[in-house]
Interface confidence: low
């Protein structure tokens, strides 16, 4: 997918725009809001009826190099007695994010934007029953 | 992509840190298409902690459209289809990276921005945590 070159008058190119070679774009990877804090309820991954674990993937040629992925612990959901109820399903909730990929070609390096699908957590759903004809 | 010559003795240079500013190819490498979550999954309706999806649009950002989840209830839906207030629906939040046009309105100049999005909701027990 390409970043749309928006043609609205809103995007008339200002004089202050930096010159950019054709087919590329300038990207400042000093992150805006780098230090913002997530104020999610504590330990929801273990308190959920569809609990999940986290694993960290690390790649030095990716920015950011660390990406955290969630995996649902169960196929079913945890009921009030703390037992797995397989009449319900734990399912992953996913979100796309952008990363910058560094590629080495001989003694040169190039950078590529990449979309990564991150599993954020899990939720408990009623299963869809497929009737066999 | 756009190649950048590396320093002499390149095998060990530039491996640790990314430069502050890079030139990247306009094509975004990815097998996943950016889909409307309402079409890609009906979990938001079938969950015991269902949520609504709200469209957040910003032409100065890429992707310009992001969907935000809002839990429908304070409690969770029980087996009878009623809201059980002994359980809580809570949002699952995730920090994601997007591109912000910088300077504003420039077509090919961006800065990475971290934003916090609510992706969906999950049903939790209000368990106590002991503080030392």
């Amino acid at each position: 997918r390409k970043i749309p070159k928006v043609g609205h008058t809103f995007f008339q190119k200002p004089e202050s725009c930096p010159p950019v070679p054709g087919g590329s774009m300038k990207l400042d990877i000093g992150i805006i809001n780098e230090n913002q804090r997530v104020s999610m309820s504590r330990n929801i991954e273990s308190r959920s009826t569809s609990p999940w674990n986290y694993t960290v993937t690390w790649d030095p040629n990716r920015y950011p190099s660390e990406v955290v992925q969630a995996q649902c612990r169960n196929l079913g959901c945890i009921n009030a007695q703390g037992k797995e109820d397989i009449s319900m399903n734990s399912v992953p909730i996913q979100q796309e994010t952008l990363v910058v990929r560094r590629k080495h070609q001989g003694c040169s390096v190039s950078f590529q934007l990449e979309k990564v699908l991150v599993t954020v957590g899990c939720t408990c759903v009623t299963p869809v029953i497929h009737h066999v004809q | 992509g756009i190649t950048i010559p590396r320093n002499p003795g390149c095998p060990n240079s530039e491996d640790k840190n990314f430069p502050r500013t890079v030139m990247v190819n306009l094509n975004i490498h990815n097998r996943n298409t950016n889909t409307n979550p309402k079409r890609s999954s009906d979990y938001y309706n079938r969950s015991t902690s269902p949520w609504n999806l709200h469209r957040n649009e910003d032409p100065e950002r890429y992707p310009s459209v992001i969907w935000e989840a809002k839990c429908r209830h304070l409690g969770c839906i029980n087996a009878d289809g009623n809201v059980d207030y002994h359980m809580n629906s809570v949002p699952i939040q995730q920090e994601i990276l997007v591109l912000r046009r910088e300077p504003p309105h420039c077509p090919n100049s961006f800065r990475l921005e971290k934003i916090l999005v609510s992706v969906g909701c999950t049903c939790v027990t209000p368990i106590v945590h002991h503080v030392a």
Epitope: R42, R47 | N88, V90, P126, V128, V131
Partner: nanobody, 124 residues
Framework: DVQLVESGGGLVQPGGSLRLSCAAS????????MGWYRQAPGKQRELVAL???????DYADSVKGRFTISRDNSKNTVYLQMNSLRPEDTAVYYC??????????????????WGQGTLVTVSS
């Protein structure tokens, strides 16, 4: 612990207005969601409106355009401005909040709390 205290209920004529308020007090660390539910005689408790920590709000379809929820974070208070009231709005209105709080050295990370309820009667 945490207490939710509602006020502002009463008798009002159809087409009239009321403003409910609900103040949360106690050893509160954070309030994730505050809002209002209502229960009419012989019916299930139902959502009226919720306001989230970021300020965005959700409303039941039956009250959209008539009711407005707002929140004063500095006072841990939520308000419900009810305009164009109808007889079917008659119910006990309960304040609700999902709150993280301390009690006796224990952090309760996310628990639903309820007020005692305030009666709203819409009748001529």
């Amino acid at each position: 612990d945490v207490q939710l205290v509602e006020s502002g209920g009463g008798l009002v004529q159809p087409g009239g207005s009321l403003r409910l308020s609900c103040a949360a007090s106690g050893t509160i660390v954070n309030i994730h969601v505050m809002g209002w539910y209502r229960q009419a005689p012989g019916k299930q408790r139902e959502l009226v409106a919720l306001i989230f920590s970021g300020g965005s709000a959700d409303y039941a379809d039956s009250v959209k355009g008539r009711f407005t929820i707002s929140r004063d974070n500095s006072k841990n208070t939520v308000y419900l401005q009810m305009n164009s009231l109808r007889p079917e709005d008659t119910a006990v209105y309960y304040c609700a909040a999902e709150i993280g709080y301390y009690s006796g050295g224990t952090y309760y990370s996310s628990e639903a709390h309820w007020g005692q309820g305030t009666l709203v009667t819409v009748s001529s």
